[in-house]
């Protein structure tokens, strides 16, 4: 008799793929543009990335540091009207893209939560949650919660409102903290909260360090669903050198949880290459005409257009990973086991029941390495075969689909491999 199938876990929509943050509408759409109507025209692009949710804004009225002139129920006319927003929601729904609204109150000011009048602000947020849930949004984000006094209790209250409306609604909180204890204390009182933080932001040094950060986090959070990003808002290039971007894309898409990206992460958008552009929200490079300030600063291979035409580009890798992440059971909700593979490397297996399994091996170092995969670290349910098929490499030159002998696995500097192998009883 065939073994019984393992019961599938309940999956919410944000469990099924990546979230894509557009914090600055104007920067995302480029010079002279930047409104909700224009964003609607970019939904096909988001579909092509196979992201499941768009984290938008803030787009509400906010006069810098002025509580009275901050209205979370009103869209800033610079971004459009409520009708434009409704139209965007409808179009996104048709394309199966959920819309999460950022309600960080004082987003133009010094302190995101104002320095005083915490209760007034909290009440405004509560009213806004109810208003926008009725309007049809799929969730909310609030950032910089380290600046919010009694954050845990407010988050719990806001979570109740969100979940009370529907279990299918999501609340994301963002913090600049990278301290695991602070992160855990925020998570403790909020069961379904998705938290983005700077926890992984200093992980770029070595494979061992990254492995220990990831495993510590997963062990500490138990079987909670988590999210993976390097910060609550900023681009990957703020933290990583160009040669590690592919490696991190592979890692973020294959860890257990929801990967969260900022617009431009898919093309390696880098503010430092665009003089004068703000680090937190540089202009999106759709094509070579997107940055007319200094035309010579932009080459085709830095743009969406140029990378779309190149199967070896970062954007093409992002699309492939996003596709795999959204359709393979082992990546959707599979178990995770990290194991030793030698200094400088981070490797792990993702597996679910009798479905195809995945092996990820990441070389964070700047020298080529032979992987000494320590299968003895793994439980019997996640044993390694002698060979696995190469699904993709972050570097060009390998023959995809070819079987690789795991005992003789060699990785190039900064290379990541995604390998697949079947379940064996």
């Amino acid at each position: 008799r065939a073994p019984r199938c393992r019961e599938l876990p309940a999956q919410k929509w944000w469990h099924t793929g990546a979230l894509y943050r557009i914090g600055d509408l104007q920067a995302f759409q480029g010079h002279g543009a930047g409104n909700l109507a224009g964003l609607k025209g970019r939904l096909d692009y988001l579909s092509s990335l196979k992201v499941k949710g768009l984290v938008l804004g803030p787009i509400h009225k906010n006069q810098k540091d002025d509580v009275a002139q901050t209205d979370l129920l009103q869209i800033d006319p610079n971004f459009g009207s409520k009708e434009d927003f409704d139209s965007l929601l409808q179009s996104a729904k048709k394309k199966s893209i959920r819309v999460i609204l950022d309600l960080t109150p004082n987003y133009r000011g010094e302190n995101s939560w104002f320095s005083t009048q915490v209760d007034t602000v909290a009440t405004k947020v509560k009213d806004a949650l109810e208003f926008w849930l009725q309007a049809g949004v799929d969730g909310f984000q609030v950032r910089d919660i380290e600046n919010l006094k009694d954050a845990s209790s407010f988050l719990a209250e806001w979570q109740n409102i969100t979940k009370g409306f529907s279990e299918d609604r999501l609340l994301i909180a963002g913090t600049n903290s990278s301290d695991l204890q602070q992160i855990l204390s925020l998570l403790e009182s909020n069961k379904d909260l998705l938290l983005t933080s700077s926890y992984l932001s200093d992980s770029g040094s070595t494979g061992e360090h990254t492995k220990s950060l990831v495993t510590q986090y997963l062990n500490a959070t138990g079987n909670r669903w988590c999210s993976w990003s390097l910060s609550q808002a900023r681009l990957l290039t703020s933290f990583l050198p160009a040669q590690l971007l592919r490696l991190y894309q592979l890692m973020l898409f294959t860890l257990p949880g929801t990967p969260v990206f900022s617009y431009g992460d898919e093309i390696g958008l880098d503010a430092a290459a665009l003089p004068g552009q703000p680090m937190e929200a540089p202009v999106m490079l759709w094509d070579e005409s997107s940055f007319p300030d200094i035309p010579g600063a932009v080459s085709a291979n830095m743009t969406v257009k140029g990378q779309s035409e190149d199967p070896g580009s970062l954007l093409s890798l992002f699309r492939r990973l996003s596709d795999q992440r959204s359709k393979e059971r082992s990546l959707l909700h599979g178990d995770f086991h990290a194991f030793s593979a030698g200094p400088g490397l981070f490797s792990y297996i993702r597996h679910w029941d009798q479905n195809e399994r995945f092996l990820v091996v990441l070389n964070f170092g700047d020298v080529g390495l032979s992987a000494g995969l320590q299968a003895s670290d793994l439980p019997a349910s996640a044993s390694l075969p002698a060979k696995a098929d190469l699904l993709l490499s972050t570097q060009p030159g390998r023959e995809e689909g070819s079987p690789l002998e795991l005992e003789r696995l060699k990785l190039e500097p900064h290379e990541g491999l995604l390998l697949r192998f079947p379940y064996a009883a």
Partner: antibody, heavy 125, light 113 residues
Framework: QVQLVQSGAEVKKPGASVKVSCKAS????????MHWVRQAPGQGLEWMGI????????SYAQKFQGRVTMTRDTSTSTVYMELSSLRSEDTAVYYC??????????????????WGQGTMVTVSS | DIVMTQSPDSLAVSLGERATINCKSS????????????LAWYQQKPGQPPKLLIY???TRESGVPDRFSGSGSGTDFTLTISSLQAEDVAVYYC?????????FGQGTRLEIK
């Protein structure tokens, strides 16, 4: 009226650092990029870098990378340029210059419509 | 880096006569997406900071007398003063802003003959 007022002349020894200030008035400080350009005695103009006063992001000419730091203080509408490890070749007049902004398109091409009066920095042992 | 070369290095012209200064860039500064030339001209008088005269190769800055005009495209540009006045004695610089680092020509000294 729109103006940029720079700090006074400085005399420094080789190896030292100098910090020049540039106070803006007559316009919204955070809405325009600021640049630093220097001119050695009897020589041409040399662009050093840019600062966006809104977020503080900077970009420096390769030649000055690692030696120059541009900062700003929005509360006083002032930008600063600090040059370290000074050598005699750094003797020059240092200008802050406001980058142009195209009001219609919001683009900010890098040419300079307003200049400070200049700060003479002399490096000599 | 884009190298800007001006000619002549110095020029003497009689009052009321036409003065022409040339500027050549080592690569094109014409941007095809907006059909604009990323070139500016400045005037610098002794002891003063430079003053913007022309941008986009041919657009006169407000307040600049109409005897100043700019022309050219791609790599070759010209600043023309149609009728030289005494107050036009200065050093003139061209500047490209097509790419960083921003670069200037070496300057052309204009004097009265």
């Amino acid at each position: 009226q729109v103006q940029l007022v720079q700090s006074g002349a400085e005399v420094k020894k080789p190896g030292a650092s100098v910090k020049v200030s540039c106070k803006a008035s007559g316009y919204t400080f955070t809405s325009y990029y600021m640049h630093w350009v220097r001119q050695a005695p009897g020589q041409g103009l040399e662009w050093m870098g840019i600062i966006n006063p809104s977020g503080g992001s900077t970009s420096y000419a390769q030649k000055f990378q690692g030696r120059v730091t541009m900062t700003r203080d929005t509360s006083t509408s002032t930008v600063y340029m600090e040059l370290s490890s000074l050598r005699s070749e750094d003797t020059a007049v240092y200008y802050c210059a406001r980058g142009y902004e195209d009001i219609l398109t919001g683009s900010r091409p890098i040419f300079f419509d307003i200049w400070g009066q200049g700060t003479m920095v002399t490096v000599s042992s | 880096d884009i190298v800007m070369t001006q000619s002549p290095d110095s020029l003497a012209v009689s009052l009321g006569e036409r003065a022409t200064i040339n500027c050549k860039s080592s690569q094109s500064v014409l941007y095809s997406s907006n059909n604009k030339n990323y070139l500016a001209w400045y005037q610098q008088k002794p002891g003063q900071p430079p003053k913007l005269l022309i941008y986009w190769a041919s657009t006169r800055e407000s307040g600049v007398p109409d005897r100043f005009s700019g022309s050219g495209s791609g790599t070759d540009f010209t600043l023309t003063i149609s009728s030289l006045q005494a107050e036009d004695v200065a050093v003139y610089y061209c500047q490209q802003y097509y790419n960083t680092p921003i670069t200037f020509g070496q300057g052309t000294r204009l004097e009265i003959k």
